[in-house]
Interface confidence: low
């Protein structure tokens, strides 16, 4: 009992997780300007892994997705990677932690198969909240050197004048998101990886007993009758993740073209 | 404090075209929206367009559509005002002026730049 | 012919109250927000009022904006030499998908 409420509440944890890891990925808020001593009229701007938006105080918020491969930052690409490997892991290991989970009979699958498919999708959880928190953390050490370069004096030629730049960059809340849908995702894989110890079957329960009778050898292995739940399994392929960089045709449509420059 | 520094004065044929340039520094260029304005001699200001670095697009007061250009370029923090098939009418000071467009609000202003349009 | 009508010349004498107006259409001050600018000579504009009523840092409170329907006005309060200059209003205009500006008021402290 306690083995099948691990493995289902690290299924669960896992899937928020995975949910969390998407959204994270698809949010535009990985880096939003740091308000902080900035002029009354300055635009708000706010930028993701895919696209960058720039929102007017009244709400007008136009948004520009990334139309080049080659001139992005290594890092963002590194980023962008990181993420969607997490987000692939994580539906594979999601696809196979179904077939794992022990209240879900299919066929007369062994539970040691089940063992192995239980493994199986922790180590997966494991990697993909990895590649998520390392992901998300590339960006915030990103964050944090830009951060306090802008905020670094600048001399200007003229009297040693001292300028500050006043717009900096800080944690936007998909990166929030992200660590928080990392370590689900981590901790849920590690419950898996728990409730597989307990599904894998133990050797020296039961030995291959040989009962000799009227000259038949018959060979008896207990394990008993396997019911199936009837259970069908649902192996359509849902859109997971749509997060490529758009087309300017795809760019969301606004009140106006003109509502900003 | 922001500075937006624009090119030097220029002396220009009818029919000819001109280019104005403007340095912004002490900000972050690319999220703000950079607009040209114009002032004839003894007259009022007028909008002739504007840009957003980030994205490159520009937007073109109607009068202008077809003759005037304006790009951003990002490395080096400056945009410019092409504007081509010039008249005597051209004659003008031009500022470059950040702020929304939107909303008509310009809180970094250049110091303008004045282009004689004279044969 | 500017879009926005403001008067072309306002005067007064220091301390007095001065107060420009600017007249424009349902498509731009009747509906988007009004800023105001002052131009001192030579100089660039600087930007006095925006958001109808809202003044930047360094505006001294002298200074206020207000609108009314299609119409909007400035104030100057306590007047001063240093206020001599030339005022514009702005609005972005629906119809023309673009700023307009007023023509201007020369204000001139007597």
């Known amino acids: 009992m306690a083995v099948t409420a691990c493995q289902g509440l690290g299924f669960v944890v896992s899937l928020i997780g995975i949910a969390g890891i998407i959204a994270a990925t698809c949010m535009d808020q990985w880096s939003t300007q740091d308000l902080y001593n900035n002029p009354v009229t300055a635009v708000f701007n706010y930028q993701g892994l895919w696209r960058s938006c720039v929102r007017e105080s009244s709400g007008f918020t136009e948004c520009r997705g990334y139309f080049t491969l080659l001139g992005l930052p290594a890092m963002l690409q590194a980023v962008r990677a990181l993420m969607i490997v997490g987000i692939v892991l994580g539906a594979i290991g999601l696809l196979v932690s179904i077939f794992a989970l022990k209240c879900i009979r299919i066929g007369s699958m062994e539970d040691s198969a089940k063992a192995n498919m239980t493994l199986t999708s922790g180590i997966m959880f494991i990697v993909s909240g990895l590649c998520a928190i390392a992901g998300v953390s590339v960006f915030a050490n990103m964050l944090v050197t830009n951060f306090w370069m802008s905020t670094a004096n600048m001399y200007t030629g003229m009297g040693g004048m001292v300028q500050t730049v006043q717009t900096r960059y800080t944690f936007g809340a998909a990166l929030f998101v992200g660590w928080v849908a990392g370590g689900l995702t981590l901790i849920g894989g590690v419950m898996m990886c728990i409730a597989c110890r307990g599904l894998a079957p133990e050797e020296t329960n039961y030995k291959a007993v040989s009962y000799h009778a009227s000259g038949h050898s018959v060979a008896y292995k207990p394990g008993g009758f396997k019911a199936s739940t009837g259970f069908g399994s649902n192996t359509k392929n849902k859109k997971i993740y749509d997060g490529g960089a758009r087309t300017e045709d795809e760019v969301q449509s606004y009140p106006s073209k003109h509502d900003y420059v | 404090q922001v500075q937006l520094v624009q090119s030097g004065a220029e002396v220009k044929k009818p029919g000819s075209s001109v280019k104005v340039s403007c340095k912004a520094s002490g900000g972050t260029f690319s999220s703000y929206a950079i607009s040209w304005v114009r002032q004839a001699p003894g007259q009022g200001l007028e909008w002739m367009g504007g840009i957003i670095p980030i994205f490159g697009t520009a937007n073109y007061a109607q009068k202008f559509q077809g003759r005037v250009t304006i790009t951003a370029d990002e490395s080096t923090s400056t945009a410019y005002m092409e504007l081509s098939s010039l008249r005597s009418e051209d004659t003008a000071v031009y500022y470059c002026?950040?702020?929304?467009?939107?909303?008509?609000?310009?809180?970094?202003w250049g110091q303008g730049t004045l282009v004689t349009v004279s044969s | 012919q500017s879009v926005l009508t403001q008067p072309p010349s306002a005067s007064g004498t220091p301390g007095q109250r001065v107060t420009i107006s600017c007249s424009g259409s349902s498509s731009n001050i009747g509906s988007n927000t009004v800023n105001w600018y002052q131009q001192l000579p030579g100089t660039a504009p600087k930007l006095l009022i925006y958001s109808n009523n809202q003044r930047p840092s360094g505006v001294p409170d002298r200074f206020s904006g207000s609108k009314s329907g299609t119409s909007a006005s400035l104030a100057i309060s306590g007047l001063q030499s240093e206020d001599e200059a030339d005022y514009y209003c702005a609005a972005w205009d629906d119809r023309f998908h673009h700023v307009v500006f007023g023509g201007g008021t020369k204000l001139t402290v007597l």
């Open positions: 002026a950040r702020g929304f467009i939107r909303y008509g609000v310009f809180d970094y």
